[in-house]
């Protein structure tokens, strides 16, 4: 048994690092390997994490940690039964992708305007909390042609656009992304899409 | 009441061997790590040793390495400390103390908040 | 290893008045914001030690709020309001952010 592709980490900057990995030929992943991690501190013990699949040849092990500090190291063994298929050391604040924004809502209520709402993803006494930016793709099912990246660098998570620079009468998609410029992190996952109908008309003077 | 009890001290010769216990009552004995501080007559404390929760990680003074062990026996909430190949600078009083809870991912510091009253170990011909 | 230096290693003081320690570590004992892996301890005569401060700055259980802790990364200071006769005692800092554990010398604090 082999690895193809060493484990590569992320760490959400709050509680949970994702490891993922390709072995040499289709395994079981939860059956077969185990990946264990120690916190390189006074004391810390070993813990396992027990991997999915991820694909025929893939595995991804999502790894409970405490909060994440600059000084926190891990030592990473990969474990095929007794033998060590892989050992290497993994910096969570080195290596951070955000968690996703959530509870991405659209109110077409607002005169002229669209409103998108969100959620961020981190509690207020979290690092990241502000310091996320994020990126709002907004596109059409009805016109492919028809896609942007709206990008919002300041602290709100809200994008208001003026309604008329939409079509009206179709239907349009948006979802979020976010990542922490100081931090140095990759962009999150987006969040789910949701989708509302513009049935925003010109006033008859403008037309 | 959270107490910690040490017994095994005594006299014993130069080259000789003692095993240190630690009974722990009153916490969740597994869940810390403990410690073994010794003072010898006269002196300062001097850190000897730390055991984590689970025992996995095992800690010792260069003045001991390769002579003590360390150890821990969670069913019967007991910490050891075996020492061996004694010299006449192991003399002193051994305390064993509390230390961190270890079964989070890192360990929670609250000090060495409980300690026994001390066995005296005396090694001498 | 890390070094703790202690000063003074001898403090006569009167009851009622402050009293103040200081430790030195040879390396930063920071380890995240707030948590400096210092703490104080007290032995008094024939007993055990026992914790006065972990962490820089937390006050043990039971431990009386004259006795309060302060400072960050290599200097640390203990510091009795207002020393009462059930103080004196030899008062040791010690470092745990890494193994070996290391204690300063030991500070004895007497009554004047």
């Known amino acids: 048994m082999k690895v193809l592709q060493e484990p590569a980490c992320v760490s959400d900057y709050m509680s949970i690092s994702t490891c993922e990995w390709k072995m040499g030929g289709p395994t079981n992943c939860s059956a077969e390997l185990r990946l264990l991690y120690q916190l390189v501190f006074q004391s810390s013990e070993t813990h396992t994490c027990v991997p999915e699949n991820n694909g025929g040849v893939g595995c991804v092990c999502h790894l409970l940690m405490d909060d994440v500090v600059s000084m926190d190291n891990y030592t990473l063994d990969l474990w095929a039964g007794q033998q060590l298929l892989w050992k290497g050391s993994f910096k969570p604040s080195e290596h951070v992708k955000p968690r996703a924004p959530g509870n991405l809502t659209v109110h077409t209520n607002v005169s002229d305007t669209v409103l998108l709402t969100w959620s961020n993803p981190y509690p207020p006494d979290n690092y990241l909390y502000n310091d996320l930016t994020y990126a709002v793709n907004i596109w059409s099912e009805n016109d492919p042609a028809y896609s942007r990246i709206h990008n919002v660098t300041y602290l709100k998570p809200t994008l208001r656009i003026p309604a008329s620079t939409l079509k009206s009468g179709i239907s349009y998609r948006a979802r979020v992304r976010a990542w922490a410029q100081h931090y140095n992190t990759t962009w999150s996952e987006w969040s789910p899409s949701t989708k509302w109908y513009n049935s925003y008309r010109e006033p008859f003077e403008q037309r | 009441e959270v107490q910690l009890v040490e017994s095994g001290g005594g006299l014993e010769q130069p080259g000789g061997s003692l095993r240190l216990s630690c009974a722990g009552s009153?916490?969740?004995?597994?869940?810390?790590?403990m410690t073994w501080v010794r003072q010898a007559p006269g002196k300062g404390l001097e850190w000897v040793s730390s055991?984590?929760?689970?025992?996995?990680?095992?800690y010792y003074a260069d003045s001991v390495k390769g002579r003590f062990t360390i150890s821990r026996d969670n069913s019967k909430n007991t910490l050891y400390l075996q020492m061996n190949s004694l010299r006449a600078e192991d003399t002193a009083v051994y305390y064993c103390?509390?230390?961190?809870?270890?079964?989070?991912?890192?360990?929670?510091?609250?000090?060495?908040?409980?300690w026994g009253q001390g066995t005296t170990v005396t090694v001498s011909s | 290893d890390i070094v703790m230096t202690q000063s003074p290693l001898s403090l006569p003081v009167t009851p009622g008045e402050p009293a103040s320690i200081s430790c030195r570590s040879s390396?930063?004992?920071?380890?995240?914001?707030?948590?400096?892996?210092v703490d104080w301890y007290l032995q008094k005569s024939g007993q055990s030690p026992q914790l006065l401060i972990y962490?820089?700055?937390q006050r043990a259980t039971g431990v009386p709020d004259r006795f309060s802790g302060s400072g960050s990364g290599t200097d640390f200071t203990l510091k009795i309001s207002r020393v009462e006769a059930e103080d004196v005692g030899f008062y040791y800092c010690?470092?745990?952010?890494?193994?070996?554990?290391?204690f300063g010398q030991g500070t004895k604090l007497e009554i004047k």
């Open positions: 103390a509390k230390d961190r809870l270890s079964v989070t991912v890192r360990p929670r510091y609250y000090g060495l908040d409980v």
């Open positions: 009153g916490f969740t004995f597994r869940d810390f790590a």
């Open positions: 055991i984590s929760g689970g025992g996995g990680s095992t």
């Open positions: 390396q930063s004992v920071l380890y995240s914001i707030g948590k400096n892996y």
């Open positions: 962490l820089g700055s």
């Open positions: 010690m470092q745990s952010l890494t193994s070996p554990y290391t």
